[in-house]
Amino acid sequence: MAVTACQGLGFVVSLIGIAGIIAATCMDQWSTQDLYNNPVTAVFNYQGLWRSCVRESSGFTECRGYFTLLGLPAMLQAVRALMIVGIVLGAIGLLVSIFALKCIRIGSMEDSAKANMTLTSGIMFIVSGLCAIAGVSVFANMLVTNFWMSTANMYTGMGGMVQTVQTRYTFGAALFVGWVAGGLTLIGGVMMCIACRGLAPEETNYKAVSYHASGHSVAYKPGGFKASTGFGSNTKNKKIYDGGARTEDEVQSYPSKHDYV
């Protein structure tokens, strides 16, 4: 039951995280005009990964897309790439994890297959979350660098006669959404990996009872396991399924390896 809960929760957390990563990537407020210690402007500038916007005091908002690809800073391109990779991996991870969910039955899919799929999706979520966190962090670092550079040259002008105010940008809402979403996806991925351990076919479920037959040392295993000859020779007892799909209760009724003292 704990495995199902962990897997289900991991899936939900990752789903929320990926939705957040998509939202952050689409948001326009990656960087927003710094209003502190600046002249009070009648416009509010903010920028996203895909376009920059200006909101006038009347409420009128005008956005312009970055219609150039080659003219954009390499860092911005890198952030875009990281976010897109994160979304793609996350989306594939979600697709895989749906089929891996223990509560969903698809034909006679074996638990080992579900375990592998759970692990795969977990890893995908972890990488997706890391991509999002990395993308947001790179952008934040870029902002911090530019912020202090523009603070150093807050006013530039010809002989001090004409002043040009340099608009400073600070962290926008999308950065926080991205960090949180990336973190959630990462946590969801870890949960999926933990769930995978519980789903994976275990080692010997019951302590074998040795019956010493004439001249042979045979360890009899419970149904579903092949007998291993040579006491203690098979250190990694592999579970060999007898073809029949077990019910959920049957699977959960076996003690796990953690039950052994």
Epitope: Q33, T41, A42, Q47, S57, S58, T164, V165
Partner: antibody
């Protein structure tokens, strides 16, 4: 047709108070920011204050902060300017103007103005 | 505060003449976010309220004749009346629309010669 009508002006003694009103019609008042601008006799225009459609933010010219208060009642389609501790230099024609939408913050419609005279 | 300087203070001209009014701001009115200039021009006739002619430094307000045109960027702006009409004799003000307080220039009076 957009119409802005100011009222409440008149003669007031120095140190006195006055409340100007601006009645708006012909447009959705609650969707627009509004300005007060004044013009001393024979002088140029001086921007006084701005109030956004939702009453926040509000901006004032520094020298009038604390003495003048701008407010609005969207239900009544009205804009107000409360003027306290009036001085002789506050004598001017006071205009209310609409903050135009998609006109780069320009003031697209103006009222005819109301004259405020501060004199003893 | 942004200081708006208009020149000349007075212009004496005849109908049909071309008029060029100048406006300079102490700070750039070009917003980097959208590369637009936030400057407006107004016309005021005696006893009347000001009327918006040009916004965004160069965009004519609807209903304004095309003889009026605005140009310039950053700190230097110009209002041009291609052929002065009798109804154009008035005072013209420029206004900073980017920074609060939204300061006006001192005005240029265009009078009949």
């Amino acid at each position: 047709d957009v119409q802005l009508v100011e009222s409440g002006g008149g003669l007031v003694q120095p140190g006195g108070s006055l409340r100007l009103s601006c009645a708006a019609s012909g447009f959705t008042f609650s969707s627009f920011g509004m300005h007060w601008v004044r013009q001393a006799p024979g002088k140029g225009l001086e921007w006084v204050a701005y109030i956004s459609s939702g009453s926040s933010p509000i901006y004032y010219v520094d020298k009038l902060k604390g003495r003048f208060t701008v407010s609005r009642d969207n239900a009544k389609n009205s804009l107000y300017l409360q003027m306290n501790s009036l001085r002789a230099e506050d004598t001017a024609v006071y205009y209310c103007a609409r903050a135009g939408y998609a006109v780069r913050n320009a003031l697209d419609y103006w009222g005819q103005g109301t004259l405020v005279t501060v004199s003893s | 505060d942004i200081v708006m300087t208009q020149s000349p203070p007075t212009l004496s001209l005849s109908p049909g003449e071309r008029v060029t009014l100048s406006c300079k701001s102490s700070q750039s009115l070009l917003n980097v976010g959208n590369q637009k200039n936030y400057l407006a021009w107004y016309q005021q006739k005696p006893g009347q309220a000001p009327k918006l002619l040009i916004y965004g430094a160069s965009t004519r307000e609807s209903g304004i004749p095309d003889r009026f045109s605005g140009s310039g960027s950053g700190t230097d702006f110009t209002l041009t009346i291609s052929s002065l009409q009798p109804e154009d004799f008035a005072v013209y003000f420029c206004q900073n629309d980017l920074f609060y307080p939204l300061t006006f220039g001192g005005g240029t009076k265009v009078e009949i010669k």
